[in-house]
Amino acid sequence: VPLSRTVRCTCISISNQPVNPRSLEKLEIIPASQFCPRVEIIATMKKKGEKRCLNPESKAIKNLLKAVSKERSKRSP
């Protein structure tokens, strides 16, 4: 993907720390694009609406993504 002259990535630091799916308000997975050459995962927590960038390579975060997608597939008819 050719990079735009203006990089519009969001995450300055990323966290490896496990996140409890129950404490999540929202989980955004932003795919790599011409504006940002990396995948970004942004968690919005229920408490105070605090946001956190998560490490897509972290085992704990991969497990979180699996848990969230499993939860979603349960909900969808």
Epitope: V7, C9, I12, S13, S15, R38, K51, R52, C53, N55
Partner: antibody, heavy 120, light 108 residues
Framework: QVQLVDSGGGVVQPGRSLRLSCAAS????????MHWVRQAPGKGLEWVAV????????HYADSVKGRFTITRDNSKNMVHLQMNSLRAEDTAVYYC?????????????WGQGTLVTVSS | EIVLTQSPATLSLSPGERATLSCRAS??????VAWYQQKPGQAPRLLIY???NRATGIPARFSGSGSGTDFTLTISSLEPEDFAIYYC??????????FGQGTKVEIK
């Protein structure tokens, strides 16, 4: 424990260049953004530049834009600040600081600082 | 650019007294303010983040409060090692990240 060691300061003439370095240890360096913050003699703190954990994002204070370049080497746990076209007003102690790893930026660990004096 | 104004510039107090430091932002920064302590010849040290959360290892005598544009750092009972310069910093999610000009807490 987290440790940041700043180096590379010295006396330099106006218009010349200098490269500062910051050696990091005691944490997973390649997941943290890193900043440079400076302090002119007897003055307050001024944020200078940031680089994201992977080097993709770089932001600079207006006062140094186009003259300073921040880089990092994740294989060596190092951050650098290349300072070109130095001016007398760049005279300061330069601190390397670790990003807090939260959504909003603050500086949770600091290096000891390295003094840059720009004088003819 | 968000401007932070600290007051007073200098606070002259005795050990054991209560110190109240103020930081005012030129526009709302929600609760995204941090406080740092700096002693002569040393790097700054993070004390408080998100207006009221103490950083790791910071004694309970340090507390922070406020939201929007007005913030306060309180030292409930000054210890000899607390005499230093204190800076506030706004933690918006885009640069530049600015500091107040500092408040010096000196021994009376």
């Amino acid at each position: 424990q987290v440790q940041l060691v700043d180096s590379g300061g010295g006396v330099v003439q106006p218009g010349r260049s200098l490269r500062l370095s910051c050696a990091a240890s005691g944490f997973t360096f390649n997941t943290y953004g890193m900043h440079w913050v400076r302090q002119a003699p007897g003055k307050g703190l001024e944020w200078v530049a940031v680089i994201s954990y992977d080097g993709i994002i770089k932001h600079y204070a207006d006062s140094v834009k186009g003259r300073f370049t921040i880089t990092r080497d994740n294989s060596k746990n190092m951050v650098h600040l290349q300072m070109n076209s130095l001016r007398a007003e760049d005279t300061a102690v330069y601190y390397c600081a670790r990003d807090s790893s939260s959504w909003y930026v603050y500086f949770d660990y600091w290096g000891q600082g390295t003094l840059v004096t720009v004088s003819s | 650019e968000i401007v932070l104004t600290q007051s007073p510039a200098t606070l002259s107090l005795s050990p054991g007294e209560r110190a109240t430091l103020s930081c005012r932002a030129s526009q709302s920064v929600s609760s995204y303010v941090a406080w740092y302590q700096q002693k002569p010849g040393q790097a700054p040290r993070l004390l408080i983040y998100d207006a009221s959360n103490r950083a790791t290892g910071i004694p309970a005598r340090f507390s922070g409060s406020g939201s929007g544009t007005d913030f306060t750092l309180t030292i409930s009972s000054l210890e000899p090692e607390d005499f230093a310069i204190y800076y506030c910093q706004q933690r918006s999610n885009s640069p530049p990240w600015t500091f107040g000009q500092g408040t010096k807490v000196e021994i009376k």
